[in-house]
Amino acid sequence: MMTGTIETTGNISAEKGGSIILQCHLSSTTAQVTQVNWEQQDQLLAICNADLGWHISPSFKDRVAPGPGLGLTLQSLTVNDTGEYFCIYHTYPDGTYTGRIFLEVLESSVAEHGARFQIP
């Protein structure tokens, strides 16, 4: 039985050109994490394999950095990066757990209503 839950760091609004961290955390299970995939819509961004380490998809190599931890850092954000991101935890013996984070990237000039945007 799958008892675990995925907690994410929550949806994010960020400025074009900035960078953000995407993180998920698997809790309430003793299952072993064998691999974590990061995807956007149907595109694979990166894989963190327990034995083989990190693999970043070639098309994202310039803008995606591994970590912190099993998370992912997206850099040089563009408006087209707006969308839903998935952390997919492959575990044994439980199976697959999926977390979802939405990212909205806004033009630098759009500081609507005094929103606080992230450029860590």
């Epitope: 609004s13 969308g83 945007f117």
Partner: antibody, heavy 119, light 112 residues
Amino acid sequence: EVQLQQSGPELVKPGASMKISCKASGYSFTDYIMNWVKQSHGKNLEWIGLIIPYNGGTSYNQKFKGKATLTVDKSSSTAYMDLLSLTSEDSAVYYCARGLRGYYTMDYWGHGTSVTVSS
Amino acid sequence: DVVVTQTPLSLPVSFGDQVSISCRSSQSLANIYGNTYLSWYLHKPGQSPQLLIYGISNRFSGVPDRFSGSGSGTDFTLKISTIKPEDLGMYYCLQGTHQPWTFGGGTKLEIK
């Protein structure tokens, strides 16, 4: 003035599918996310999902995956929601609502489209 | 999914009263950067929901200053300082920090 004009009420038979439209005016359609919300029994509000007009990306409430399909036509500044294989549980008022940039909420709403599923 | 619990379900008031509506979430609504996406709506019969408060405490344009929002983490409050006839209706909170977005069950503000 921001306006979201939704299509009119629908009476449909169980098992049928239908499409609700939401025509946006008074702002740049591709600059704002469009959300869809279901209101059942005149009370409960449920977020169905959203669509990003400029790249077509979507995010669904898993509860509505396979039930609702969101699309846009940028040339007419119109968002659409297809509702599939309708049952009496789908009888509700459906709203489109523009996203408030940077805040994960909705600022302007359509007037709602009433859908009744009955044989 | 994040569960959002609103209390009370019904709130009988007299005009001129000050009232508070509570909204609690099953997990923190602060994201990794400390931003909290919690908003409040008023839904009147025969109308569309109208945004009152976003980002915990920001009043949307045209919303009177008798409406105020506060809170943090999992605990949030909407205060209406002096109830007027046009304030009657259903109040909902909405969390947009976690996918999917989820609404509270609503609070009906009605005359005693």
